[in-house]
């Protein structure tokens, strides 16, 4: 009988035992147990992976794979021997011994063992497929590296290089820039230098102004006067020869000449025939008493006595009752004409009244009173105005009814506070009221959120301090 | 009587505007300026600005210029406060007050109950 | 801007005792001085203005008086419901400014 049997050895090879008769066969023969299972990543058979294994881990299976191919090697050459060997030893015994079913199970034996052997050399064949696949895709892996590596090194000698271009157009730019500096600070003094000449220059020009003013103020004066003297002389003629003939009516002539000469306001001037605007004196009514006023002759037909002008902050207005009073300033620039002239002069015939007004952007306006008059000191020059019209408001400015003239030594308001004090200047304060023409002069940029400057409320607010302002009066008749 | 109403608290995030307003009733509305004051937590009070109903004018704390803007709505008798570009220091609650006068910005006769501002990120 | 400083911080007094508080402003603002009472979650509320005027509804027990650049809030008789922060202010210069506080308490 025949019984063909697998099992293990101690080592776990597979053994192959054929026992016929009274001989027993055994066959050991090599396994892949070195070979990882196929949970294993590198099973070449497995799923392949997208990114490539790690450089060592390949080179590490490789050399594993080589060890298996070896191992399998040898064992099939020992197998090719022991097969040969076994195959002459059973020829040998079937030649001597001439049993015909011996050799049925030596065919039956040749034939397993073929197939063990055709079995093993297929797996072979893969496992060498397996380790071609995979020396390929190293090989790839590895040349992809190489490229990767290459690629990189060149883009850092790029950026090497471009750092170094940074590096020296930086460093020209800096070099440039110090340069500049120093050119900047140069020119800078240079500027300053020339500023500084500048401002010598305008202050001596404004000196020269000033002085160009006052000489023709001076020559306008002069030119009244020698008006006045030629007028005078042809007078004097005339009256020389009328004298002649009765000395009483020329007693008469002179005394009416005489009185023909004195000015009340700019409307007596300009009708006098003087229509050049500029310093005129004026007589106070009904007395021998002489104040310098500007008179324009030019604004709405002219004959206009200026009572009060802001322009430049030239001319303190945080004023005494007593100058407020007789007036102060230049008539030619910043002045108060003087409330006590002005309340004689309003008192005497019905005036107009005109506030002129400029922004510091430039734009105008102007308030006309229609009925204008101060109440004598008796009653603190309070202020009467009617009939407003005009482009700087709607609502009067100076409030209704008028109220007291009040200076920072003379508290007539109706606040408990001192508005003089507050405000500063003096003006007809109510408590203390939309306006201020006297108040305190800011120049361009610090005019806005003043509560104590220039005011005019109807037209520009409450903290809006004006650039120039112009009070001027005419009779309502001319 | 005489009153002023603001809108309510605002949680606001840092760079962010917020505006509040004030409701005035019980007076003629264009006859007095109207005033912002802050109080910030532990601080003192603030003038922010002023508004001027009767002609928009209006007059800022050089502290907030540029950051704040005040207006007023005279047909809803409403003032507004919008103040830009937040940062944490602008926690505070913000008051509404009228002036005496309305010619002058001087002491402030009725305030309105406050409004909670809190900027967080 | 002109800086008003108020002294002291805090103050406690016993009912009906005196209390007076200070503010000094660091340069000359005439009388341009308001004082306000602040309760807690509450507005301020104007008390005297041009340094010693009364508000309408105000009781007499609260004056105030100085000029210049030294001022005074007296609370003649203190009373439970005048329990507060006290605020001065000056409007006589631009931007207006407060004194940063004195916060009354009773004894």
């Known amino acids: 009988y025949s019984n063909f049997r697998k099992s293990m050895d101690s080592v776990g090879r597979k053994q192959y035992q054929v026992q016929h008769g009274s001989c027993s066969y055994t066959f050991l023969l090599p396994e892949t147990d070195n070979c990882r299972s196929s949970s294993s990543p590198y099973v070449s058979n497995a799923v392949q992976r997208d990114a490539p294994l790690d450089y060592d881990d390949s080179v590490h299976r490789l050399q594993v794979l080589e060890s298996i191919m070896e191992n399998n090697t040898q064992w099939l050459m020992k197998l090719e021997n022991y097969i040969q060997d076994n195959m002459k030893k059973e020829m040998v015994e079937i030649q001597q011994n001439a049993v015909q079913n011996q050799t049925a199970v030596m065919i039956e034996i040749g034939t397993n063992l073929l197939n063990q052997t055709a079995e093993q050399t297929r797996k072979l064949t893969d496992v060498e497929a397996q380790v071609l696949n995979q020396t390929t895709r190293l090989e790839l892996q590895l040349l992809e590296h190489s490229l990767s590596t290459n690629k990189l090194e060149k883009q850092i000698l790029d950026q090497t290089s471009e750092i170094n271009k940074l590096q020296d157009k930086n460093s020209f730019l800096e070099k440039k820039v110090l340069d500049m500096e120093d050119k900047h600070i140069v020119q800078l003094q240079s500027i300053k230098e020339e500023k500084d000449q500048l401002q010598v220059l305008v202050s001596k020009q404004n000196s020269i102004i000033e002085e160009l003013e006052r000489q023709l103020v001076t020559a306008t004066v002069n030119n009244s006067a020698l008006q006045k003297q030629q007028h005078d002389l042809t007078e004097t003629v005339h009256s020389l020869l009328t004298m002649i003939a009765t000395s009483s009516s020329a007693k008469n002539s002179f005394a009416a000449k005489e009185e023909q000469i004195t000015f009340r306001d700019c409307a007596d001037v300009f009708r006098s025939g003087l229509t050049t605007s500029g310093i005129y004196t004026l007589t106070f009514p009904n007395s021998t008493e002489e104040t310098k006023a500007y008179c324009d002759m030019e604004t709405g037909g002219g004959g206009w006595t200026t009572i009060q002008r802001r322009e430049d902050g030239s001319v303190d207005f945080q004023r005494t009752w007593k100058e407020y009073k007789v007036g102060f300033g230049n008539p030619s620039g910043e002045h108060w004409l003087g409330n006590e002239f002005v309340s004689q002069l309003t008192n005497q015939q019905r005036y107009v009244l005109k506030i002129h007004l400029r922004d510091w952007e430039g734009n105008e306006a102007y308030s006309l009173y229609e009925h204008f008059y101060l109440s004598s000191e008796e009653f603190n020059y309070r202020i009467h105005l009617k009939g407003l019209t005009g482009t700087a408001g709607k609502i009067s400015s100076i409030s209704q009814p008028g109220n007291d003239f009040s200076t920072k030594d003379a508290d007539n308001d109706k606040c408990i506070c001192k508005c003089s004090q507050m405000l500063t200047g003096g003006w007809w304060f109510d408590a203390c009221g939309p306006s201020n023409l006297n108040g305190m002069y800011y120049p361009q940029r610090q005019n806005t959120n003043k509560f104590n400057g220039i005011k005019w409320y109807y037209w520009k607010g409450s903290g809006y301090s004006l650039k120039a302002t112009t009070m001027m009066i005419r009779p309502a008749d001319f | 009587q005489v009153q002023l109403v603001q809108s309510g608290a605002e949680v606001k995030k840092p760079g962010s505007s917020v505006k509040v307003s004030c409701k005035a009733s019980g007076y003629s509305f264009t006859d007095y300026n109207m005033v912002w004051v802050r109080q910030a937590p532990g601080q003192c009070l603030e003038w922010m600005g002023y508004i001027d109903p009767y002609n928009g004018g209006t007059g800022y704390n050089q502290k907030f210029e540029g950051r704040v803007t005040i207006t007023a709505d005279e047909s809803t008798s409403t003032a507004y406060m919008e103040l830009s570009s937040l940062r944490s220091e602008d926690t505070a609650v913000y008051y509404c007050a009228r002036t005496r006068d309305r010619y002058d910005v001087w002491y402030f006769d009725v305030w309105g109950q406050g409004t909670l501002v809190t900027v967080s990120s | 801007d002109i800086v008003m400083t108020q002294s002291p911080d805090s103050l406690a007094v016993s009912l009906g005792e005196r209390a007076t508080i200070n503010c000094k402003a660091s340069q000359d603002v005439y009388i341009a001085v308001a004082w306000y009472q602040q309760k807690p979650g509450q507005p301020p509320k104007l008390l005297i203005y041009?340094?010693?005027t009364r508000d309408t509804g105000v009781p007499d027990r609260f004056s105030g008086s100085g000029s210049g650049t030294d001022f005074t809030l007296t609370i003649s008789s203190l009373q439970a419901e005048d329990v507060a922060v006290y605020y001065c202010?000056?409007?006589?210069?631009?931007?207006?400014?407060f004194g940063c506080g004195t916060k009354v308490e009773i004894k």
């Open positions: 202010h000056q409007y006589s210069s631009y931007p207006p400014t």
């Open positions: 041009w340094a010693s």
